[in-house]
Interface confidence: low
């Protein structure tokens, strides 16, 4: 079937359109194009005779049409009036006619639109704004964009006038956005430049910063006010209702108590005509003086004196605080606070009470600290110590003894030999000593402030012959696998070699044996029962040698798992049952028995005469070593058969 296709169907003014013919019949004489939906000679555009290839213009020919041999018609430089139907009349060789009609529509190219507004500065929550997309164009569709997004759904947004007008009712500050309109028709689409809606709003209730309302006398008061507003608000400050200045900031240096009061910030928007105020109440507190500590005793004596520390000055209705060593006061019966906390009393001071001590005065804003105070506690002297600890010396060496006693103020020292004063020094030095220098050496420490004295006496023996040594032990009854024992060979002597023997043999190599202190001390780690041996120490120098008496180590151990004898478990009725329990233990353990869980006697031997089958059951022996604190047990099952039924035993 003969058909006409318009390419394109929608044509922009000034462009061209091709009326394309499909299914053109064979054996044609010619064809004609007409404007309209029917063949009308008055509206012929062009005719074409195939034989002569001659095209003849008709009354409706405009000079913009071109006919092709395949009957298609090209119309150039399209105008609005070209819109409509076009009919092709085909004349076949047999003079039978055929017709087909096509159509196209002509649209104008749209100009770039623009937005007009009925209100360039609308007021929030009051005004409406109508945007209109210009120009008005026939057969155009109007679209709107907000911030490059399609219009949101909102009861405050209304489209009218064929979508050409966008109305925003009761504008808010959030409507401050970029608005664009777009026009569309089938041949073009154009978007306007953006229009920014400038919504006048505010001022909102102003905020005053900073938020703090308490200040100290002497500080600077610097208040800032801000209110959301378009255009930006103009600010005024009032203090206690009196106008101060028209600035956003209020600055008052070096404030006093007189600056306390109500501070009002007023924000004004000249375009909306609105005013909003916010009030803050500022309180200025007087600056208290820096506290300081007084003491009733600047040099207290340890364990004798009390000290009262007082926080100055005295201020009514003030909270006093105390710190010792930068920490709050510890709970102690020796520390007492007065009712107002202003006085801290230390009862019976010790050398550890030196401090430092601080007191504080608390006010509304902060705590003011005093400078720290340190107590000068007089103490000592403690018992002096004489070093070195040697008591035996060989003739010809130098004797150098030093004395020290903890004391404040530092002790004064005196040396006495056999009760005779020698010198007032901390060190005692005697060169090239002889046996005559043997004796009692006394160090006396004296504290001049407290008047106290303490003495220590040391026996010094000067002899070419070494004394017979002895062994001291730090643990006379060590527990196996738990304790260590340290044996020390006494006395400590200069230029002396220390030796050890165990059961008459030199020390075995063992990781549990360790010599220290110049071989003078022998330590046994994790003692075992096998360490219960005879230990001897010896001392020797170039002149003599000597051995101690043996010391036997008493190792506490056990109880081990007990053994019940005899081993038999089957007996004949009428026999005597005689069970003996034994467990390795030092000291010997306590024994007890249970039969079928029922406690029996506390003996090592359990004897039951003339047993019967009623004596069947479990026989348990319990052992306990009170020294090691350890327990152990074993259970044995006994079966008693009636006479003759089993080859049992008689006891």
């Amino acid at each position: 079937k003969l058909t006409i296709e318009s390419t394109p169907f929608n044509v922009a003014e000034g462009k061209e359109v091709l009326l394309l013919v499909h299914n053109l019949p064979q054996h044609l004489f010619g064809y004609s194009w007409y404007k309209g939906e029917r063949v009308d000679g008055n509206r012929q555009i062009i005719g074409y005779v195939i034989g002569t290839q001659q095209a003849t213009p008709g009354p409706a020919y405009s000079g913009r049409e071109i006919i092709y041999p395949n009957a298609s018609l090209l119309i150039q430089n399209i105008i609005q009036n070209d819109t409509g139907f076009y009919t092709l009349h085909v004349i076949k060789s047999d003079l039978v006619n055929e017709e087909a009609t096509g159509q196209f529509r002509v649209y104008p190219e749209l100009p770039k639109p623009s937005i007009s507004s009925n209100n360039s500065k609308p007021v929030e929550d009051k005004d409406a704004v109508a945007f209109t997309c210009e120009p008005e164009t026939q057969d155009a569709t109007y679209l709107w964009w907000v911030n490059n997004q399609s219009l949101p759904v909102s009861p405050r947004l209304q489209l009218s006038n064929g979508n050409r007008t966008l109305t925003l009712f009761n504008v808010t500050r959030n409507d401050t956005a970029s608005y664009k309109c777009e026009t569309q028709n089938p041949v073009s689409a154009r978007r306007s430049d953006s229009v920014i809606l400038n919504v006048l709003y505010g001022p909102d209730a102003p905020t005053i910063s900073p938020l703090n309302t308490s200040y100290r006398s002497g500080e600077n008061l610097n208040l800032s006010c801000h209110a959301a507003s378009n255009p930006p608000a103009q600010y005024s400050w009032f203090v206690n209702g009196t106008f101060q200045q028209s600035t956003q900031e209020l600055f008052i240096p070096n404030i006093t108590v007189n600056n306390s009061g109500s501070y009002t910030c007023q924000a004004h928007n000249s375009d909306t005509g609105l005013n909003r105020t916010t009030v803050t109440t500022i309180t200025v507190y007087a600056e208290p003086p820096k506290p300081f500590i007084t003491s009733n005793n600047s040099n207290p004596v340890e364990d004798e004196d009390a000290v009262a520390l007082t926080c100055e000055p005295e201020i009514q209705n003030t909270t006093y605080l105390w710190w010792v060593n930068n920490q709050s006061l510890p709970v102690s019966p020796r520390l007492q606070l007065s009712n107002d906390n202003r006085t801290l009393t230390l009862l019976s001071v010790t050398r550890n009470d030196v401090g430092p001590y601080e007191c504080g005065i608390q006010n509304e804003l902060s705590v003011d600290h005093s400078d720290p105070v340190i107590l000068n506690v007089l103490y000592g002297p403690d018992d002096p110590t004489i070093s070195p600890s040697y008591t035996y010396y060989r003739p010809g060496v130098n004797l150098s003894l030093s004395c020290h006693a903890a004391s404040n103020p530092p002790a004064q020292y005196s040396w006495l030999i056999d009760g005779n004063i020698q010198q007032h020094t901390q060190e005692l030095f005697i060169s090239n000593i002889t046996e005559k220098n043997s004796g009692l050496y006394t160090c006396q420490a004296n504290n001049s402030a407290s008047g106290h004295s303490r003495t220590t006496v040391k026996t010094i023996t000067v002899s070419a012959e070494l004394p017979k040594p002895s062994i001291s032990s730090n643990n006379s009854k060590p527990v196996e696998d738990k304790d260590a024992v340290a044996f020390t060979c006494e006395p400590e002597a200069q230029n002396t070699t220390y030796l050890w023997w165990v059961n008459g043999q030199s020390l075995p190599v063992s990781p549990r044996l360790q010599l220290s202190n110049g071989n003078r001390t022998l330590t046994l780690f994790n003692v075992t029962r096998n360490d219960a041996r005879a230990y001897v120490c010896g001392i020797q120098n170039s002149v003599s040698a000597n051995r101690s008496d043996p010391v036997t180590l008493d190792v506490l151990y056990g109880p081990d798992t007990p053994i019940i004898s005899p081993p038999d478990s089957s007996y004949l009725s009428g026999a005597n049952l005689n069970l003996s329990c034994h467990s390795a233990s030092n000291p010997s353990p306590q024994y007890s028995w249970r039969i079928n869980g029922i406690p029996q006697q506390h003996t090592q031997v359990l004897f039951i005469a003339k047993i019967t089958p009623n004596n069947n059951g479990t026989y348990a022996c319990f052992v306990s070593n009170l020294a090691t604190g350890r327990n152990n047990s074993i259970v044995k099952s006994i079966t008693v058969s009636a006479s003759g039924t089993s080859p049992g035993l008689s006891a």
């Epitope: 910063s209 900073p210 255009p231």
Partner: antibody, heavy 119, light 107 residues
Amino acid sequence: EVQLVQSGAEVKKPGASVKVSCKASGYTFTDFYMNWVRQAPGQGLEWIGDIFPKNGNTDYNRKFKDRATLTVDKSTSTVYMEFSSLRSEDTAVYYCARSGYGNYVFDYWGQGTLVTVSS
Amino acid sequence: DVQMTQSPSSLSASVGDRVTITCRTSQDINIYLNWYQQKPGGAVKLLIYYRSGLLSGVPSRFSGSGSGTDYTLTISSLQPEDFATYYCQQGNTLPPTFGGGTKVEIK
């Protein structure tokens, strides 16, 4: 006396990041905004952004929003500016400045930190 | 962003001269216009805030005026310590922006 003390000069390669610190003293640190401003050699001043130490809220110049990060350590009264993806045109003196009067009045400034970006 | 145009970019003057520096903004900034001084060492110091507010400690020979989009910094009698670069800055609209600076040199 209000003082803003900045960290020392830095030399960085293009593409790297730099972190500059600004330690404040002599005032209530959390009550005032801290701003960062830069000045390229022989050029004027350019605002980067600000931070409110009390809550860590920040505002940035759109130009630097993707590359500048402002943080605060209230315990040390220190504000930090980290600047990433450095380019040679980021070579500048970077200042911290306190806003003491609202509406971006910079009443105290740090001594400045020179950041040099060079391959 | 609000554009800040400062003029002149530099000027030569003598001690005792009256010096005027102007700053023009691309839009009305209310009164939120501040002036700063930068000495050659790099230290920046606030002089005037909110168009005419003289910061505590700043000599009274410095003054500020203006409204809308046109603002002026005046030094009534130039002193040796005043030779520096001066910047205007607006705080009305984010981001705050600075003028290009005016360098005041000794004639």
